[in-house]
Structure formats: C-alpha cells, structure tokens
Interface confidence: low
C-alpha cells in the first residue's frame, strides 16, 4: 500500500521528504518565501495531503504561485511609478511614490520606494504599510519675487504668480441694515486655510462687541490678479470663520483670524501657500525688508476720509505690492505716542515703512501678509498681517503701517487648524 513518489512543486517543498510513503503518511506542501500554495483557486500558506489505503494520494500536489500585491493605492497629490519592467506587482517588485512637484513635497523626506512583500502588501522601510503624505510646499512662488520695488501707495503692479498665497476676501454682510459689503486680503496657509486680520472678518456692528461675520457672507478668491477679471481665479466659500478670542476692537490687539475653506483648493503656479514663522516673541528684526501685496487704495490723491464718507471701498484693479523695512518697536511706539488719540502699539504688533513716507499699505489691504524671505529655509514667511495705520493719509511722513506679529500666534493657529472643531483633519507644512 505504498503511494507514488511525490515531486515538489516549482518554488516549493514537501515535508517530510521520504523515499517511501505508506498508508496514513502525511506530507505538508509549502512554498518558498514570496510564493503561496494555489489549490482550487484558493490561496493558502500550506497544504496537507495523505497517503490513502488504496495507494493513492488524497489530493494532487498544488502549485506555488508568486505573491501579487495588486495595483498600488493612489496617492493624494502624488503619483506612483513602477520600477520593475512590465509594471509587475508581484513579490519583490518595486514602486516609487512621488509628490506633485513643485507644489507638494513628501512628509518625513522618505524615499517613497515600496516593495511587494511576501505578505502581499506594498511595504516601505520607514512607513511600513502606510502611504506617504504629500504636503503643500509653502513660500516658494513659481516666479522669483523681485529684489527691488520702486515706490499699495507707491507700489507697483504685481505679475500673475508673484504672490500665489494672496487671497481677496469679500464680505457681504446681509445681516446688517443696509447690507454692508467690504473686502480685505488674506494669505493661503494650506489647501483649506486662509490667514487674515480679525478686523476684516468682524461684523461691522454699532457697538464694540466682537462678533465674526457669518461664514455664509464670506467669499475668498485665490489666484486672482485683476479684480475686473475673476475668470481665472478660484473662488471659495467659508466653512468656518475663526477670530482670535482676545481680539480687541478698541486697539486692534490680537488682530488675527482664520478662514477654513468649504473645499480644499487645488494648488498650482498661481495658488500656493505661504509659510508660518517659528513661534518666537521677537518677530522680525528692524531694517529687515518685507513685501506686502493688496488691492487696496493705490491713488495717493484720494484721502481715506473721502473713501469712507462716500461709502465705497475703492479697489486697485490689479494687485499691487510694495517693499518696506521693519521699523524698531521703540521708534514706532514713539511716532504714535506723539499723536493725539489713543494709539497703542502692543507687543503683538510691529511696524514697517519709511520715515519720509511715500510707500505704505492702505485701506483695503487689511489682512494681507507681510512676507520676509528666510535665508535659512529659502522660503518666504508671513511675519505680519496688515492691521492698522495712523490718522493721517496712507504713506504720510513718519506714519508707519502697523502689522500683526504673526510669530506670537503660531501655536494658536496650529491649535485651531488641528483642533477637534476643525471641519476635517488638516496637516500643513511649517
């Protein structure tokens, strides 16, 4: 009652290996690493057969089939390429994930190489079975920002793509009687978050309570160059409007806010985020040069009072920008203390501009980012937000523009963007 000699399957083995197999002897068929036993269209690790009384084996020897990891999962904001010929997805095949450059980069700077493991899963040395994450690249416009700027008073037209983080925020507060409409600027921090000044998003009430405008009343435009032609721009409604809880309407202390967009915006040459600074109380050093852009008043012959009294909020049609030096806190404080009126320059603010005037931000530029190039990281960083100015006309002599010191709020910003209250989990490159 001997059973016939067994031939092990290709890429497999039989245990125990005996010269003779008799009735009731059992053998276990297993496959080499990266192969699985294939029997009746079912895949298993091992398969047992037995020598029967009539000298026949209970089953045929199964085959060993190479493990197949299948088509790799798609990567959000990335792509996958096959390193192995014929786009093989079997054991020891390699694939490489990469992010959509130059707009996204890989978190943790992993190689992005995944190998088909013996377990049938695509595996990376560092991330194991987890997919890599493609994060937005911040503060690196596709067009290099210029070094020199002549004299959004004393500014010049920006070319499309120079300030890809620049957002136009339009607020139409239908809860007011009569309806109130105004605008400001903001800066894109990620696909879903806009940084701006709190006063841009405060409901224009007749008292001093700070109530944010309803999200339904906010529209954000990105990739916009000329306000007369919004066809190429991305417009988005707001999912959330978050004012800094300590924003003070009397002195504009803590003048900072966030808008979470209803839908993430696609990044590209004309829509890219700005970087946040490191959290440090010092803020930008005096004499450092920064750039600020906006669609605010650019006509030095029109006074702010005229604009306010006429009820219109005059825009520059084309995005303007200006280069301004940071002014020491002491000098700025002194310049405002010498004026009549209660002008408080707090530690949450810094000033920029020229003693002789001529270049400045103005009404309508509010909330726009004052950006400084960080030599160490080679990124542009939002160090300030256009906040307020003195009683005189924009660009007046010895009246500096006052900016929210963003570095004081980095922790608050990250908390809000990653809090359980956020509409969805978002990661942003710092």
């Amino acid at each position: 009652n001997e059973c016939p000699k067994l031939q092990p399957p290709v890429y497999g083995k039989i245990e125990p290996s005996q010269a003779v197999y008799s009735f009731k002897d059992q053998v276990l068929v297993s496959c080499d690493t990266g192969y699985k036993v294939l029997k009746d269209n079912g895949v298993m690790d091992t398969f047992q057969i037995e020598c029967l009384k009539d000298g026949a084996w209970s089953n045929k020897i199964p085959t060993c089939k190479i493990v197949d990891c299948g088509a790799p999962a798609g990567l959000k904001h990335g792509l996958v390429t096959f390193s192995t010929r014929n786009n093989l997805t079997t054991y020891k095949s390699e694939i490489r994930y990469s992010c959509q450059q130059p707009y996204y980069k890989m978190l943790h700077n992993t190689t992005g190489v995944y190998t088909c493991s013996a377990h049938g899963t695509w595996t990376n040395e560092v991330l194991k079975r987890s997919l890599p994450t493609c994060l937005p690249v911040c503060g690196q416009p596709s067009r290099a920002l210029p070094n020199l700027v002549k004299r959004i008073i004393g500014g010049r037209n920006a070319e499309l793509g120079l300030f890809p983080w620049q957002a136009l925020i339009v607020v139409e507060d239908t809860s007011r009687v009569p309806n109130d409409k105004w605008f400001g600027s903001g800066a894109l921090l990620s696909e879903s978050w806009i940084l701006t000044a709190a006063h841009v998003l405060r409901s224009q009430r007749r008292d001093n309570t700070v109530i944010p405008v309803s999200k339904e009343h906010v529209t954000v435009y990105l990739g916009l160059h000329d306000v007369r032609d919004k066809s190429g721009a991305v417009n988005s409604s707001a999912a959330r409007v978050i004012l800094h809880p300590d924003f003070n309407i009397q002195n504009y202390n803590h003048d900072i806010a966030l808008v979470q967009l209803q839908k993430p915006v696609p990044l590209g040459a004309h829509v890219m985020p700005i970087c946040l600074p490191r959290p440090e109380p010092e803020g930008p050093a005096p004499h450092m040069l920064g750039l600020v852009a906006g669609w605010g008043i650019s006509n030095p012959n029109v006074t702010v009072d005229e604009i306010i009294l006429s009820g219109t909020r005059t825009l520059s049609d084309v995005l303007q920008y200006v280069k301004l030096p940071v002014v020491s806190h002491a000098e700025c404080k002194a310049s405002y203390e010498s004026r009549s009126g209660n002008y408080s320059v707090t530690e949450n603010m810094f000033c920029a501009g020229y003693y002789e005037g001529g270049k400045d931000t103005c009404l309508g530029d509010s909330g726009g980012a004052f950006v400084i190039f960080d030599e160490m990281s080679q990124h542009w960083v939002a160090q300030g937000l256009v906040s307020w100015g003195g009683p005189e006309e924009c660009g007046s002599k010895q009246v500096y523009g006052v900016y929210t010191k963003v570095s004081n709020y980095v922790d608050w910003l990250w908390e809000e963007m990653n809090s359980p209250r956020a509409v969805r989990d978002l990661q942003v490159e710092r």
Epitope: I211, W414, E415, N418
Partner: antibody, heavy 114, light 112 residues
Framework: QVQLKQSGPELVKPGASVKLSCKAS????????INWVKQRPGQGLEWIGW????????KYNDKFKDKATLTVDTSSNTAYMDLHSLTSEDSAVYFC???????WGQGTLVAVSS | DIVMTQSPSSLAVSAGEKVTMTCKSS????????????LAWYQQKPGQSPKLLIY???TRESGVPDRFTGSGSGTDFSLTISSVQAEDLAVYYC????????FGGGTKLEIK
Amino acid sequence: QVQLKQSGPELVKPGASVKLSCKASGYTFTTDDINWVKQRPGQGLEWIGWIYPRDDRTKYNDKFKDKATLTVDTSSNTAYMDLHSLTSEDSAVYFCSSLEDTYWGQGTLVAVSS
Amino acid sequence: DIVMTQSPSSLAVSAGEKVTMTCKSSQSLLNSRTRKNYLAWYQQKPGQSPKLLIYWASTRESGVPDRFTGSGSGTDFSLTISSVQAEDLAVYYCKQSYNLYTFGGGTKLEIK
C-alpha cells in the same frame, strides 16, 4: 456672569424618549460649542458629543451615535439633547458644558423605570 | 479610540499631605506642531458638577489654587496636590482632547 441652566429631573419608561435642555446666558451662545456628558450613579464621566451653535455642526462619541441627538435653538440660547429607546443603562445624570468646559450645568437626572 | 487609564482608583490621605495621581493614554497626546499636550484634569466634588482644574497638561485654570499642579507629556501624566485640604475631597478625572474627548475612570480622593 456665565450660566448653563439645565432642565429638571425626568422619570421615563423603558423604550420611551426624553429631551433635555441646557439654557446658556452671560456669553454669546454661538461663539462656543456645547458639550454633553453622561454620569451613571457612582460611575465616571462619559463624553456624549458636542454641537457648535453657529452652524449646527455636531460630533458624537461612537457609543452614543444612535442614542443621542444634539440640537440648538439660537433664538433662546438653548441646547437640547434627545435620548431615544431608553433602557435602565441610560439612567444617569447628564451634564452640559460650554466655553471649553469652563462652565457646567447643574446636571439633569434621568431615571428609566417601568 | 484613545483609552485613558487612571491610577489609583482611590486613595486616602491626611490633610497637609502631598498626593499624586496618574493618568496614562493609549497614544500620545502631544501635538508636535503646537507643542501642547491635549490633556485636562477635572475635580468633581460629591453632588456637584465637574470643575476644570488644569488644561494642556500643566496650565492651571484661572482661580484654581496653586497647590494643584499638572505635569507630564506624551502618554504619561500626573496631577499633584502639594498640601491636601479637607475641601479637596473629590473624584479627579483626566480627559484627552487630542482626538474628540475621552475621560479616565477617575481617582477618588478621601481625607483620613
């Protein structure tokens, strides 16, 4: 000053539903979410969920997804919690809290008994 | 879901003694971006509503006596009462707010 005033005790039959209320005063109701917490007699605290009055957005503890429904009425500055298909396991004190748990209601006792 | 484990479940100390209770989370509560631990401590006296004592693991809520100190980071946290007073008789709960909210089982503090 900030106050959260909750509705009075409830004695309900198994299988029935009950609606608890939490009336806020002393702050702008729409600026912060309202949390609801359960505490069975002699037991610990269990987070049920929260609601953001400004846009009615809610988040629930998975355990309470089919048990509780959170709503608000901004005209009366009141948050509500509906509890459905009550069993003896739902007998507990239910608290509401706001302004990041700085302020709490006094609690509402719900007793489920036939 | 994040699981919060408190120990001991109860302890009895004399007035004036120092007491420490611990809270462990099943995953880190430290947000590396904000550099904050999303853990809070609450005190619940008999028949009362809970009261917030500490947030961000170590920041004392305004009006809370300075004998209450929170410490720890990542997954291991503790609440210390430097000199227990009779009015500290209560159950103390930790709560994570890193991902939604979960309370620990509580530590009952009794005064000898």
